[in-house]
Structure formats: structure tokens, C-alpha cells
């Protein structure tokens, strides 16, 4: 129960905490278990003990093994074991499972990735963050304190995130990296009365006679996958298919997108070679789901010709 697994990479700093806790005033002795040899406390040593912490500055593969810590108080002794493994640096980008810290799960709301074990180190902000070995760039990523915040989390944000920081010990700097997986979970979906994003109700669109124009009907229906969610155009209250005018066509199929996690559906009405009679029609954008139907109306008007008179 009082044994803890710790790992690191060669030539990086590794700091291990004794699995047995005690007040900071308690003395903690560290030993190399195989030989029962005491770990020195002098900081000039590459490996030294500092209270509850055992420091490898830097670590070497040969440091791997089990270390014993004994917390000594006036009334009791508590023994713990630190199982330390130091690995060779990987030549490629791939981070093997045995170097990974616990996976964190994220969602649109849940978007912090903490840098593992950083609390043990004397680090200075900002941290560097990498995803699948690529440095993170862009305003969606905010490195703050010991964590990374991702704005507007999307499914393709899933992956392996590595934090890199510098540990400072008596003026000497040592690099530390730590990697954990980030998975994106679907938030619980829900359905609601449709909300039409476009067009605005009773909107008027200016068009030029003889030109082509597109009208987009866009509505959102809730979050996650929807059982029923459809948008369509009507002309003067009739289905497009019932309106025998080949110049006016509704886009085949409907485009479903997820905007901020919302399930939104778009369909485009394409009008070729706009004619005067098209200005007399009423164009209705209809959004329908199990909660009901919402309708927004848009009309076309002629663009004012440019006045060429002097």
C-alpha cells in the first residue's frame, strides 16, 4: 500500500515524494533498498534526499530501483517505498504507455489539462505544451500556471499532451517533460425547440435581376445527435418540389454541423437567373423537430441601380 511507482527520462530531473506522509518537521531518511545504503542529503550529489523528497539531478538509467523512506516522529516511524524507473529517451515522437500519466477527460466545459507531478519541482512559468510532439499554437490554447486550457474543445483535440518545464536547483537548470492523454467525451445530449439562426424573421434580401442568389436556412436543435431535426424551404407555403420552377432548387441533402456542441442543420435555396416574379414570392425557412415547428420568412427586393447621372 505504501509503495509508489515513479518514472522519468535519462538526463532529465526527477523528484520523488515519500509515499508515507508526515509533518514537514519530521525527519525523513532515505535508503537504497537493495544495499540498505543511506542516500546523502548533501546537494552536491547528483542523487540526494531533501526531507520528503528524493531528487535525481539529473536521472540516469542506472538509478532505477526501489528506494526506502522512513518518516521519523517522536512517537512513531513510518516506512514507504518508491519504485523508480528511469528510461532512455525515445528517438521518435511516440511516447510509450509506460511513460504516460493518468488520462484526463475533457469536454466543451471541461478543458484543463494539468501538467503531472509539477508540484514537486521548482519551476517557472510559462510551461511549454506539445500535442503529439507538435508545439501548440493558436489563441485556443492558453498555458497558465501548471495547466493548459483549451477553448472550445473539439473531438480532434484528443491526443497525447506533453508539458515541458525547467526545474531550478541552486542556480542549475534541469529539463522535465511529462505526458498524459486527453480524451474528449460527449456531453449529455439534449433536444430543444428549434432556434433559427438565419435568416432573421421578416428579413429582406437585395438581389440583382438576372444574377444568381443563395438563401441559407440554418437552425439549431439542441446538443449532440438528434433523433429528428430538419430544415427546409417553402415558397408561398408550398414545398419546393411542388413548385414547378427548375430555376429554384433546394440543395440536395442537409449539412449537419456542431457549433459549440450544438446540433445545427443548414440547407441552401439556390435561385438561378433571378426574375421579377421571384420578388413577389414569400420564402419560408422551416425548422422542425419533435418539439415543434419554427418559421422565418424572407423576401427578395431589387437592388437599387447605381445612379450614373451627373
Amino acid at each position: 500500500k505504501f509503495s509508489k511507482q515513479s518514472w522519468g527520462l535519462e538526463n532529465e530531473a526527477l523528484i520523488v515524494r515519500c509515499p508515507r506522509q508526515g509533518k514537514s518537521s519530521y525527519i525523513v531518511d532515505w535508503y537504497y533498498s537493495q544495499t540498505n545504503k543511506s542516500i546523502p542529503t548533501q546537494e552536491r550529489n547528483r542523487v540526494f534526499a531533501s526531507g520528503q523528497l528524493l531528487k535525481f539531478l539529473p536521472a540516469e538509467v542506472a538509478d532505477s530501483g526501489i528506494y526506502t523512506c522512513i518518516v521519523r516522529s517522536p512517537t512513531f516511524n513510518r516506512t514507504g517505498y518508491a519504485n523508480v524507473t528511469i528510461y532512455k529517451k525515445q528517438p521518435d515522437c511516440n511516447v510509450p504507455d509506460y511513460l504516460m500519466y493518468s488520462t484526463v477527460s475533457g469536454s466543451e466545459k471541461n478543458s484543463k489539462i494539468y501538467c503531472p507531478t509539477i508540484d514537486l519541482y521548482n519551476w517557472t512559468a510559462p510551461l511549454e505544451w506539445f500535442k503529439n510532439c507538435q508545439a501548440l499554437q493558436g489563441s485556443r490554447y492558453k498555458a497558465h500556471k501548471s495547466f493548459l486550457v483549451i477553448d472550445n474543445v473539439m473531438t480532434d483535440d484528443a491526443g497525447d499532451y506533453t508539458c515541458k518545464f525547467i526545474h531550478n536547483e541552486n542556480g542549475a537548470n534541469y529539463s522535465v517533460t511529462a505526458t498524459r492523454s486527453f480524451t474528449v467525451k460527449d456531453e449529455q445530449g439534449f433536444s430543444r425547440f428549434p432556434v433559427i439562426r438565419a435568416p432573421a424573421h421578416n428579413e429582406t434580401k437585395e438581389v440583382e435581376i438576372g444574377e444568381n442568389t443563395n438563401l441559407t436556412c440554418s437552425a439549431c436543435f439542441g446538443k449532440g445527435a438528434q433523433f429528428l431535426a430538419t430544415v427546409q424551404w417553402q415558397l408561398n407555403g408550398n414545398k419546393i418540389t411542388d413548385f414547378s420552377e427548375p430555376r429554384i432548387q433546394q440543395e440536395e441533402g442537409q449539412n449537419q454541423s456542431f457549433s459549440n456542441g450544438l446540433a445545427c442543420v443548414n440547407t441552401v435555396l439556390r435561385i438561378a437567373d433571378v426574375k421579377e416574379e421571384d420578388l413577389l414570392l414569400r420564402y419560408d425557412c422551416l425548422a422542425l423537430n419533435l418539439h415543434g415547428l419554427r418559421r422565418h420568412t424572407i423576401r427578395l427586393s431589387r437592388k437599387n441601380p447605381i445612379d450614373h447621372q451627373s
Epitope: I118, D119, K145, F147
Partner: antibody
Framework: QSVEESGGRLVTPGTPLTLTCTVS????????MSWVRQAPGKGLEWIGY?????NTYYASWAKGRFTISKTSTTVDLKITSPTTEDTATYFC???????????????WGPGTLVTVSS | AAVLTQTPSPVSAAVGGTVTISCQSS????????LAWYQQKPGQPPKILIY???TLASGVPSRFEGSGSGTQFTLTISDVQCDDAATYYC???????????FGGGTEVVVK
């Protein structure tokens, strides 16, 4: 190093009110700042914070009701449309420098009392 | 939003005795350790005692000890003094963008 709140007063419901937290002895470019409130005889309630890099975050119940902004030496909390439930002492608190978490505030102001009443 | 549930008030303690206050979170705090303990006396702002679940804040006597991880945390005050009479709050930080949450507070009465 200290922080002090000001601007608390009696306001009628719906009248916007801005509280100001003035800091001295440290830089707002190195510390996050939080606003916390406490209704009379009640517990503490976290409202939101503004990070050293100017990003603002709010408790879910506070979104739209409060706005946090800052200058080089002040942090403002705007109560957009106060209701009687917003009657409380409002505290400004400094987040510890270089702490890893977001819950540790080492310097607090004495608080400023806001009373919302018609 | 997360909910932090503290030991119900009031908790009585004798001078020289030990008092334990628990704080349970409905979800894991950030990094499993983003929890702080505060002491508040009437008419005063809160004062930080413990941060990162178990780290003693500067100037705070070692009689105060924080422990726990994930969702379950404890503040232990040993060798209780009259001056420890106050209300104690836990505050958790979470993986959410925001929603830091205070516990409801636990009043400690010293006899």
C-alpha cells in the same frame, strides 16, 4: 503588499454598480485576482477571476450578471443589474504567485458592502 | 457545478484538544489536489491556512494540517487554542474553465 475594495453602497435594483479593487506592492501581470462575496450571515461565494494574462472566467451562476476587468493597478467588478440577492460584502483576493492551482488566495481585502434595496 | 460538503456546524473542541473538519467534493478537484482551507473570523476577510490540499501557507502554525486527495479532504487542528475559534471553509478548483467552489463552512467553537 495589499488589496483594498471600494465602491460599495446602497443601490436600487437594476442600477449597475462597479466595485474597484486597488492593489499595491505587486503586479497584476504576475497574479490572478478573484472576487468573492458573502451575504450577511452566510458563507463565502466565489464569483470569478481575471488571470494575469487578462482572461476572465466566471462561476456558472455569475455569467452575465458580473463583469471583471482590470487596469495596471485596479481590478473592477461590475454588477450589471443588481437584485436584492446581490446584497453582500464583496472581497477581492490575490492568487498566490506561481502556485499551481486556482484555489489559493493569500492576500484579501477587508471587503466592501453592497446593499441592494428599493 | 461541483458541490463541496463540509462537516456540519458547529464543532466543539476543548483547548489543547484536536478537531477534524471534512470536506467532500462531488467531483475530483483539479490535479486531485487543488483545494485550499481558509479561516474566517467575524468582521474579517478569510485567511489562507492550507493550499494544494496539504501545503501549509506561510506564517500558519504547524498545528494546522491538511490531507486528502481527489474528492475527500480533511483539516486537522491539533492542540486547539482559543484563537482557533472561527469558521473554516474549503475551496476547490476544478478542471472546468471556472466554477471554483466554496464549501458551506464549519464553525469551530472552543470551550
Amino acid at each position: 503588499q495589499s488589496v483594498e475594495e471600494s465602491g460599495g453602497r446602497l443601490v436600487t435594483p437594476g442600477t449597475p454598480l462597479t466595485l474597484t479593487c486597488t492593489v499595491s506592492g505587486f503586479s497584476l501581470s504576475s497574479h490572478d485576482m478573484s472576487w468573492v462575496r458573502q451575504a450577511p450571515g452566510k458563507g463565502l461565494e466565489w464569483i470569478g477571476y481575471i488571470w494575469s494574462d487578462d482572461n476572465t472566467y466566471y462561476a456558472s451562476w455569475a455569467k452575465g450578471r458580473f463583469t471583471i476587468s482590470k487596469t495596471s493597478t485596479t481590478v473592477d467588478l461590475k454588477i450589471t443589474s443588481p437584485t436584492t440577492e446581490d446584497t453582500a460584502t464583496y472581497f477581492c483576493a490575490r492568487d498566490q504567485y506561481r502556485s499551481s492551482g486556482v484555489s489559493d488566495y493569500d492576500i484579501w481585502g477587508p471587503g466592501t458592502l453592497v446593499t441592494v434595496s428599493s | 457545478a461541483a458541490v463541496l460538503t463540509q462537516t456540519p456546524s458547529p464543532v466543539s473542541a476543548a483547548v489543547g484538544g484536536t478537531v477534524t473538519i471534512s470536506c467532500q467534493s462531488s467531483q475530483s478537484v483539479g490535479n486531485n489536489n487543488d483545494l485550499a482551507w481558509y479561516q474566517q473570523k467575524p468582521g474579517q476577510p478569510p485567511k489562507i491556512l492550507i493550499y494544494k490540499a496539504s501545503t501549509l501557507a506561510s506564517g500558519v502554525p504547524s498545528r494546522f494540517e491538511g490531507s486528502g486527495s481527489g474528492t475527500q479532504f480533511t483539516l486537522t487542528i491539533s492542540d486547539v487554542q482559543c484563537d482557533d475559534a472561527a469558521t473554516y471553509y474549503c475551496l476547490g478548483g476544478y478542471d472546468d474553465d471556472a466554477d471554483n467552489t466554496f464549501g458551506g463552512g464549519t464553525e469551530v467553537v472552543v470551550k
